[in-house]
Structure formats: C-alpha cells, structure tokens
C-alpha cells in the first residue's frame, strides 16, 4: 500500500512539476525591467525565451518574437535546449509512469516490468528536473552578470549633457516557477525510484544457508532483487542500475497598430 501511495504521489508531483516546466518555458516573464532606483518609466519591459514584450502605461502590450536563431546569444539557446530536453524527458517519463502505476492493470504485465518502468520514469523525472533547474539557473546567472554590468554604466552621458536611460533587468516570475517546477519534478522522480524498490516481485528471502561440498565450502546468500532499466525480461539478482544515456538534442518583426497581444 505504501509503495502504491509513494508511486502515485511521485507521479502526481512529477506531473505538476512538468506542467510547471512547460508553463515556465512558455512564459514571457523570464526577465523583467528592474524598477528599483530607476527613473519611473511609462513602459515596462519584460523578456522570455521566445519573445520580448513591452507593456505601456496605456495598457497596451506589444510582443515581438525572436525570429532569428543565429543572432541570439548562445546562453539563451542553451537555456532553450535545456528546457526543451527537460520537457521531452518529462513527457516520456509521464507516459512510461502511467503504464507503470500499480493501480493500473494492463494485460498480464508482470510486477518486474512495472518496477523497470517505474525506475525508468523516475530517472527521467530526475534528469528532467535537473535540466529545468540548470536552464533556469543559467538564465539567472546571465541576468545577474548583465545587471551589474548595466549598473556600472546605468546612465551613459552623451557629451556630458544628455542622459540615456539604461534598462536593467531582474528575475522574472518564470524563473521562480521554473525552479519550483524543476524541484517538484526531481522530488517526484526520487519518489518513483523509491517506489521501484518495493514493486519488485515478492521473493522468499531464505536465511543464509551453508552448503558443504566435498573439498571446499561455499556460503551462498540469495540477494535481494534489483531491477534493471530495460523493458525486456529481467535477469535475476542483477545489481546494476543502468541510468541510460542522456542526449541534449535538441525573426524580429515590427507589428502594426493592430498587432497587439
């Protein structure tokens, strides 16, 4: 019962986490204009992974997509890749974990296969969560670096007369959503891995028995069942957790007056 609860909870937590990662990836507020110690402007700038937006005090919001790939900073591309890998792994993990749930019966699927699938999905969730956390952290680091660089020359004097407002950006809501979501996915993955241990087929664990053969004595202890990550038939007493390989595979327009979001 505890195993089913752990597995179910792990699934739900991971599901919420992956939904959060997707939401964070799609959100426009990865970085927002820093309002502290700045002139109060009648426009508010914020940026996401896919587009940048400007909200005017009039209430109108204009968003422009980054319609170039080559012109974007490498760091932004890396963050995009990490988030997409996290989403893909998480989605696959969810798909696998649905079939692995103890409360769901699919044909004559053995518990050993469910254990394999639970472990696989758990590992996928862990990697997915780590990808999201890494992506958000890389972006946050980029923001911090740029923030202090722009603070150093917050007002660039033009001929000592005219001042130019230097827009500084700080952490947006998407970063916090991403961190929390990544953490939840990670926790869900750990819970799935823990649940995997209890999903193993019940085997009779005999007490250690000494068999005395002529010439020499051998002590044999049947080991506890360890699940492999493969979906095929399981080898008894396999003590290797195979994490599996992880890959990270992975245009500026001017809107008219009526193109507003």
């Amino acid at each position: 019962m505890a195993v089913t609860a752990c597995q179910g909870l792990g699934f739900v937590v991971s599901l919420i986490g992956i939904a959060g990662i997707i939401a964070a990836t799609c959100m426009d507020q990865w970085s927002t204009q820093d309002l502290y110690n700045n002139p109060v402007t009648a426009v508010f700038n914020y940026q996401g992974l896919w587009r940048s937006c400007v909200r005017e005090s009039s209430g109108f919001t204009e968003c422009r997509g980054y319609f170039t790939l080559l012109g974007l900073p490498a760091m932004l591309q890396a963050v995009r890749a990490l988030m997409i890998v996290g989403i893909v792994l998480g989605a696959i993990g969810l798909l696998v974990s649905i079939f692995a749930l103890k409360c769901i019966r699919i044909g004559s699927m053995e518990d050993s296969a469910k254990a394999n699938m639970t472990l696989t999905s758990g590992i996928m969730f862990i990697v997915s969560g780590l990808c999201a956390i890494a992506g958000v952290s890389v972006f946050a680091n980029m923001l911090v670096t740029n923030f202090w660089m722009s603070t150093a020359n917050m007002y660039t004097g033009m001929g000592g007369m005219v001042q130019t407002v230097q827009t500084r950006y700080t952490f947006g809501a998407a970063l916090f959503v991403g961190w929390v979501a990544g953490g939840l996915t990670l926790i869900g993955g750990v819970m799935m891995c823990i649940a995997c241990r209890g999903l193993a087929p019940e085997e009779t664990n005999y007490k250690a028995v000494s068999y005395h053969a002529s010439g020499h004595s051998v002590a044999y202890k049947p080991g506890g069942f360890k699940a492999s990550t493969g979906f095929g038939s399981n080898t008894k007493n396999k003590k290797i957790y195979d994490g599996g390989a992880r890959t990270e595979d992975e245009v500026q327009s001017y809107p008219s007056k009526h193109d507003y979001v």
Epitope: V43, E56, S57, S58, F60, R64, Q163, V165, T167
Partner: antibody, heavy 117, light 113 residues
Framework: QVQLQESGPGLVKPSETLSLTCTVS????????ISWVRQPPGKGLEWIGE???????NYNSSLKSRVTISKDNSKSQVSLKLSSVQAADTARYYC???????????WGQGTLVTVSS | DIVMTQSPDSLTVSLGERATINCKSS????????????LTWYQQKPGQPPKLLIY???TRESGVPDRFTGSGSGTDFTLTISSLQAEDVAVYYC?????????FGPGTKLEIK
C-alpha cells in the same frame, strides 16, 4: 463613437478642493487608461496624472501632494480632485484617453475652472 | 523631470511651403525594449482640445494627412509639414511619453505668411 466629457464647477474659492468628473462613452474604462491635462489661459499644456485600467495611478510630482484621481468603471466616470487650490490652478482641465505610445488619442472639450474668491 | 524644448517659438510659412518644428528632450526617449521613441506630437487649434498627430515619434495617427511626418530618435525630434495648408494654422506640442512626469514642450505657433 468615442466621447469624453468633463464636468464640474467653473468657479472654486482659494484653499478649497476642485472636483471634476470625466464621463466617457464608446469604450470601457477597464480597457483604456485615462489621463488629465490642464492648460492655463494662453499658456501650454501640463500633465496632471493618469489612472490605469487596473485602477493604479501616477501623478505629476509637482501636484502629487494635492491631487487624487479615481474612477468608477460601472458609471464610466473618472474623477479628479485637487485640494488647496490657488489662483495658479486656474486653467482649462482636459481628460484624455491613453492609446498607443501612451499618447492621448481622444480628448474631452475641457472645462474651464477659475480659482477666485 | 524631463525638460522638453521646442524651436522655434513661432513659425511663419507660406501656403504650400514646408514647415519644420524641432523638439529636444533632456533625456533619451528611446525604449530599449522595443526600440521605439516615446514622443508624441499634438496640434491645437484655438478654442479646441489638442489633436493627436504622431505617436512613437514617427507613427501617424489614423486620419492624419500624410503631409505630417515625424522623425528623430533619442533626444532630437522633428515634425515636418511638407506642404502647408490653411487649416494647419495651430500650436504644435511635443510630449515625452516615456519617463514620468509626462512633460509637454512649450509649443510652437505656426502661422501663414
């Protein structure tokens, strides 16, 4: 069609509070922000402040301690209150609808307020 | 506060001729987020409220004749009337729509020679 109409007393005594109302039609105050601008006779325009769609406000720093802008979305009305008025506050007061670029695309005809005892 | 200055104070131009009004701000009105200049031009005729001509420094408001053109970036802006008509006699104001308070220029009075 879009219309804005200012209303209020044309004469206010010094040190009293000036109260004006801007009644709008043809659009909703939940979709558009409203700005107040005044113009002393024969002089230029002075921005007083604005009220945003969500009800937030921003005022001219020179008038901030005396001015209050509020609105009633259901009545389609925006009100301007200016306390402790003096002769220098004598002006034609306009309300305008904020549009793209924070510009004012529609204006009321304005109401002339004279501060005199 | 941003100080807006306009030149000249008054301008007399013959019908059909080009009229140019300049506006200068004490701080840049360029928003880096969308690379737009938050400067607006208004026309005010005697006894009337101001009328919006140009926003974002160069975008003409719908219904405004194409003889009105706005240009400039950062701190220096220009309103050009390519061929002056009799109905263009008015006072023209520029406004900072970027940094609070949203200050207006003192105005330029345009008259016919």
């Amino acid at each position: 069609q879009v219309q804005l109409q200012e209303s209020g007393p044309g004469l206010v005594k010094p040190s009293e509070t000036l109260s004006l109302t801007c009644t709008v039609s043809g659009f909703s105050l939940t979709s558009y922000a409203i700005s107040w601008v005044r113009q002393p006779p024969g002089k230029g325009l002075e921005w007083i402040g604005e009220i945003w769609t969500g009800g937030g406000t921003n005022y001219n720093s020179s008038l901030k301690s005396r001015v209050t802008i509020s609105k009633d979305n259901s009545k389609s009305q925006v009100s301007l209150k200016l306390s402790s008025v003096q002769a220098a506050d004598t002006a034609r007061y306009y309300c305008g609808r904020l549009s793209y670029g924070n510009s004012l695309d529609y204006w009321g005809q304005g109401t002339l307020v004279t501060v005199s005892s | 506060d941003i100080v807006m200055t306009q030149s000249p104070d008054s301008l007399t131009v013959s019908l059909g001729e080009r009229a140019t009004i300049n506006c200068k701000s004490s701080q840049s009105l360029l928003n880096s987020g969308n690379q737009k200049n938050y400067l607006t031009w208004y026309q005010q005729k005697p006894g009337q409220p101001p009328k919006l001509l140009i926003y974002w420094a160069s975008t003409r408001e719908s219904g405004v004749p194409d003889r009105f053109t706005g240009s400039g970036s950062g701190t220096d802006f220009t309103l050009t009337i390519s061929s002056l008509q009799a109905e263009d006699v008015a006072v023209y104001y520029c406004q900072n729509n970027f940094i609070y308070p949203l200050t207006f220029g003192p105005g330029t009075k345009l008259e016919i020679k």
